[in-house]
């Protein structure tokens, strides 16, 4: 859960498990399963299988989320699980559509106040640590549906009610229309569509492409911000280096982002964030001597 993320000492500079945006198609191999005299065949995919105890995890997360967020107390977690399950169970896992997730999306409808949406790209853990502190700002994973699925993998198989715990399609090696990728594309699109006011995005200044057109942010969210509702996008470029004082807002990929956003009639601002690890370390250990004295 988010508390576990906050408890982690280290800040990891990576995208996280749910950004699958290259579109390669392939076919997995078949392996026999079942112990009867007639072998049953299960597709062998290139990706890791469904996270163990997936149904229990989703249900438990739903219960915890609705306890902590009073505005979602009306949500029936059993119905949420049924809708989640219905999106991928008995379906060929390379042929999942956004339509499959609509019943779940409907149940998980939630609004973020204007100016309080935080998008992120390739810097998931720090974005989550930040929204733990700044409680009234929200990443997708602070919303019910994102919270349920964060860091999980799932898939089923055609014509059986079973969950596949052995393997699931890899978006690069197998197919892009798999249950996990389609889920994140669906909820990311919706999250961006409903944003209003000034929207913030946290970007990883340690990457060669600070803004990457192939990330979920670059390929889905940027294009689904609504100019009639969103006045501006403010990018926070997070510096990783201790002595890094460069102005990364001048980076060519940031200029590219500015161009895309400006063409969509949304204003663009950029801010360098130096030493965010310092702030978050002091959240974690307020008595640390470096937090009580000068730099």
């Amino acid at each position: 859960g988010l508390n576990d993320i906050f408890e982690a000492q280290k800040i990891e500079w990576h995208e996280g498990s749910h950004h699958h945006h290259h579109h390669h198609h392939g076919s997995g191999s078949l392996v026999p399963r079942g112990s009867g005299s007639l072998p049953r065949w299960r597709q062998q995919w290139s990706g890791s299988g469904t996270t163990s105890r997936f149904p229990e995890t989703v249900l438990a997360r739903c219960v915890k989320y609705t306890e902590v967020h009073p505005e979602m107390r009306h949500v029936d977690c059993q119905s949420v699980w049924d809708a989640f399950k219905g999106a991928f169970i008995s379906k060929y896992p390379c042929n999942i559509t956004e339509e499959d997730y609509q019943p779940l999306v409907k149940l998980g409808t939630q609004t973020v106040p204007c100016n309080k949406t935080l998008l992120w790209s390739r810097i998931k853990d720090l974005a989550h640590q930040f929204t733990q502190v700044q409680r009234d700002m929200f990443t997708l994973e602070d919303m019910l549906l994102g919270y349920l699925a964060d860091d999980l993998t799932w898939c089923g198989e055609f014509n059986t009610f079973e969950i596949n715990y052995q393997s699931c399609p890899d978006w690069r090696k197998d197919c892009s229309n798999n249950p996990v990728s389609v889920f994140w594309k669906t909820v990311s699109r919706r999250f961006a569509e409903t944003a209003c006011g000034v929207v913030h995005v946290m970007l990883n200044g340690s990457r060669s492409k600070i803004f990457d057109k192939n990330s979920t942010f670059g390929s889905v969210e940027v294009h689904n911000l609504q100019p009639e509702k969103v006045q501006a996008l403010e990018a926070w470029v997070i510096h990783g280096g201790r002595e890094d004082s460069r102005d990364l807002c001048q980076d060519p990929t940031i200029k590219e982002l500015e161009s895309i956003i400006s063409k969509r009639n949304i204003r663009f601002f950029c801010k360098n964030i130096y030493r965010p690890d310092k702030f978050l370390q002091c959240v974690k250990n307020p008595e640390d001597s470096s937090c009580l004295s000068g730099i």
């Epitope: 988010l2 502190v133 700044q134 965010p276 310092k278 702030f279 002091c282 959240v283 937090c291 000068g294």
Partner: antibody, heavy 125, light 107 residues
Framework: QVQLVQSGAEVKKPGSSVKVSCKAS????????ISWVRQAPGKRLEWMGW????????TYVQKFQGRVTITADESTSTAYMELSSLRSEDTAVYYC??????????????????WGQGTLVTVSS | EIVLTQSPATLSASPGERATLSCRAS??????LAWYQQKPGQAPRLLIQ???TRATGIPARFSGSGSGTEFTLTISSLQSEDFAVYYC?????????FGGGTKVDIK
């Protein structure tokens, strides 16, 4: 040790604005958040909002939304609280305080330590 | 908004006595509560955080306990410098809110 020193007392007319400053010393300004809390005569302490200077993000309590603006100047390690459209009920001592985080059950807890010495704002015609 | 109710409003006691102050929350706030001391003309000072953890430099005679909706601040043996107003504050839910205070005065 972190010390917060606030600007002096102010007397203001109803309808006007007041801007109180809070200068931090002895600590790393970008490594913490600053909150503003007020205490009106005979009333309980009231949290108004906060700022996280390194990100520039603010939170305002709904009661003060639209009337309060909290800002910070990293170069001088100073936080500011401006309250507009003043009325007599805004007569109070205004405190700034560093936010100290604790281990919460879901979110990190927000405590106040240390506090500035307070600034008395009197609103009177 | 979570409402914190402190009792008694005033507690009259003598130096050396034990003082027990109560803070009740309008809904469960787990252990997300702090206690502050305020003397006349001064800013509040953090005494206890996370329900029972003493802040840096706070004497051992101050202790906090409780979780859910019922919390207690105990001063085991009152010293002359302990006569002041005490406030509780919750951090479970935004907005952060304070209790109305308990004044501890000399009997």
């Amino acid at each position: 040790q972190v010390q917060l020193v606030q600007s002096g007392a102010e007397v203001k007319k109803p309808g006007s604005s007041v801007k109180v400053s809070c200068k931090a010393s002895g600590g790393n300004f970008i490594s913490y958040s600053i909150s503003w809390v007020r205490q009106a005569p005979g009333k309980r302490l009231e949290w108004m909002g906060w700022i996280i200077p390194i990100f520039g993000t603010t939170t305002y309590v709904q009661k003060f939304q639209g009337r309060v603006t909290i800002t910070a100047d990293e170069s001088t390690s100073t936080a500011y609280m401006e309250l507009s459209s003043l009325r007599s009920e805004d007569t109070a001592v205004y405190y700034c305080a560093r936010v100290k985080y604790g281990s919460g059950s879901y979110y990190p807890n927000n405590w106040f330590d240390p506090w500035g010495q307070g600034t008395l704002v009197t609103v009177s015609s | 908004e979570i409402v914190l109710t402190q009792s008694p409003a005033t507690l009259s006691a003598s130096p050396g006595e034990r003082a027990t102050l109560s803070c009740r929350a309008s809904q469960s706030i787990s252990s997300n509560l702090a206690w502050y001391q305020q003397k006349p003309g001064q800013a509040p000072r953090l005494l206890i955080q996370d329900s029972s953890t003493r802040a840096t430099g706070i004497p051992a005679r101050f202790s906090g306990s409780g979780s859910g909706t019922e919390f207690t601040l105990t001063i085991s043996s009152l010293q002359s410098e302990d006569f002041a107003v005490y406030y509780c504050q919750q951090s479970d839910n935004w907005p952060l809110t304070f209790g109305g205070g308990t004044k501890v005065d000399i009997k």
